[in-house]
Interface confidence: low
């Protein structure tokens, strides 16, 4: 173990731009201050002298999600009878670089509504709200990622297991299905242009069968009928 109490295993945990820096060790002997900066700016301190091993940096990284950020965790001895003050240059460790636009994980999407009419199935994906602000309002995931954000629909006859896929760069699918057949489906957010962290987890599965439709309506999910 590092006797200076220097933090280690600095890890960015970020989903839909909600961004937390985590580190180790949990220690009764040390407290921590986190600093964050871009390549062009001075360090800004957050989570002053915390005993926790995580720090929410969302407010900083959403200022410009296209920027690359670096954080560092400074370690100080916890105040006790033997401590006369904090060192001028506390030991610290740097985080990996983090670019929110490229590195935030895509959260699990939610199917907002669906409707099967004849041979057409319309599925709408809920546009998740992020903590990115523009003109005082929170932007949706779509407003941040634009045409970079696609959704993939996985769908199959309720009576079989063979999955088909469809893709859209809006939040809506309109696909051809067999009349009178029930279908199940789930969706996944995808950013094809990313080199990594391209895909979200799949949404919960929905089905068009009447029984399940009634159960969903009772629990707050809605079919939209036009």
């Amino acid at each position: 173990a590092d006797t200076t109490g220097r933090a280690y295993n600095l890890t960015w945990k970020s989903t839909n731009f909600k961004t937390i820096l985590e580190w180790e060790p949990k220690s009764i002997d040390h407290v921590y201050t986190v600093q964050i900066s871009t390549r062009l700016e001075n360090w800004k301190s957050k989570c002053f002298l915390t005993a926790e091993t995580e720090c929410d940096l969302t407010d900083e990284v959403v200022k410009d999600v296209g920027q690359t950020y670096m954080a560092r965790v400074l370690s100080y001895p916890a105040r006790n009878g033997n401590t006369t003050g904090f060192p001028e240059e506390p030991p610290f460790r740097n985080s990996p670089e983090f670019t929110p636009y490229l590195d935030t994980n895509l959260g699990q999407p939610t199917i907002q509504s669906f409707e099967q009419v004849g041979t057409k199935l319309n599925v709408t994906v809920q546009d998740a709200r992020t903590l990115v602000r523009r003109n005082g309002t929170f932007l949706s995931l779509r407003a941040v990622f634009g045409k970079d954000l696609n959704y993939t629909l996985y769908y199959w006859r309720a009576s079989s297991t063979g999955k088909k896929t469809a893709t859209t760069n809006t939040n809506e699918f309109l696909i051809d299905v067999d009349k009178g057949e029930n279908y199940c489906f789930s969706v996944q957010a995808v950013i094809p242009s990313r080199k990594r962290k391209q895909r979200s987890p799949e949404s919960l599965t929905e089905c068009t069968s009447r029984e399940q439709g009634r159960a969903r309506e009772m629990t707050g999910h809605h079919h939209h009928h036009h």
């Epitope: 636009y101 523009r134 932007l139 407003a143 809006t170």
Partner: antibody, heavy 124, light 108 residues
Framework: QVQLQQWGAGLLKPSETLSLTCAVY????????WSWIRQPPGKGLEWIGE???????RYNPSLKSRVTISVDTSKNQFSLKLSSVTAADTAVYYC??????????????????WGKGTTVTVSS | EIVLTQSPGTLSLSPGERATLSCRAS???????LAWYQQKPGQAPRLLIY???SRANGIPDRFSGSGSGTDFTLTISRLEPEDFAVYYC?????????FGGGTKVEIK
């Protein structure tokens, strides 16, 4: 107020590479797409291609083999390169911002901010 | 490629008159992807209408857009002196995004 300022060489010889840059002032690259459009003398507008802040691109197939659009988020600017130019590439070249809007669950774009244009002449 | 054909090529009208500009697409266009731009000599195009009928910020209500499918229209209810310019329709739904050839609205 977002403004686009563009610059680059105005006079080229055939077979050279056109290179233009567009800087974004008063706003971020993120959340938008960024396009290049050209207009030959006395003619209409032709879309060349676009790029997102992540670097994803779409090009006009008629120019795709010669076009590269790139983005530099650290400088808040994006660039156009068009190789092997000929006299047919003589035009005013514009950069523009593609802004998103919503309508009935769909997600669409319009070009709401334009650069002033750069005149490029290809002549031997 | 979706070809947008604008007509007429030139429209000669007097201030105060109504101008009706047509844009016809070679294939169906989702109206949400249809925009209109105004361009004056020596200037960059200026967004007027997006989504076929929504006016851009700062555009006077004498400008209106309509249409769907393959036929779209830009109407200027009463021409002002500053409205004499070239007008372009554009679709941004299918790559390559394309512009119409333009309609020049000139003073009669």
């Amino acid at each position: 107020q977002v403004q686009l300022q563009q610059w680059g060489a105005g006079l080229l010889k055939p077979s050279e590479t056109l290179s233009l840059t567009c800087a974004v002032y008063g706003g971020s690259l993120s959340g938008y797409y960024w396009s290049w459009i050209r207009q030959p003398p006395g003619k209409g507008l032709e879309w060349i291609g676009e790029i997102g802040a992540s670097g994803s691109t779409r090009y006009n197939p008629s120019l795709k083999s010669r076009v590269t659009i790139s983005v530099d988020t650290s400088k808040n600017q994006f660039s156009l390169k068009l190789s092997s130019v000929t006299a047919a590439d003589t035009a005013v070249y514009y950069c523009a911002r593609d802004t998103p809007y919503y309508y009935e669950g769909g997600y669409y774009y319009y070009m709401d901010v334009w650069g002033k244009g750069t005149t490029v002449t290809v002549s031997s | 490629e979706i070809v947008l054909t604008q007509s007429p090529g030139t429209l000669s009208l007097s201030p105060g008159e109504r101008a009706t500009l047509s844009c016809r697409a070679s294939d169906s266009v989702d109206s949400s992807y249809l925009a209109w731009y105004q361009q004056k000599p020596g200037q960059a195009p200026r967004l007027l209408i997006y989504g076929a009928f929504s006016r851009a910020n700062g555009i006077p209500d004498r400008f209106s857009g309509s249409g769907s499918g393959t036929d779209f229209t830009l109407t200027i209810s009463r021409l002002e002196p500053e409205d004499f310019a070239v007008y372009y329709c554009q679709q941004a739904g299918v790559v390559p995004y394309t512009f119409g050839g333009g309609t020049k609205v000139e003073i009669k």
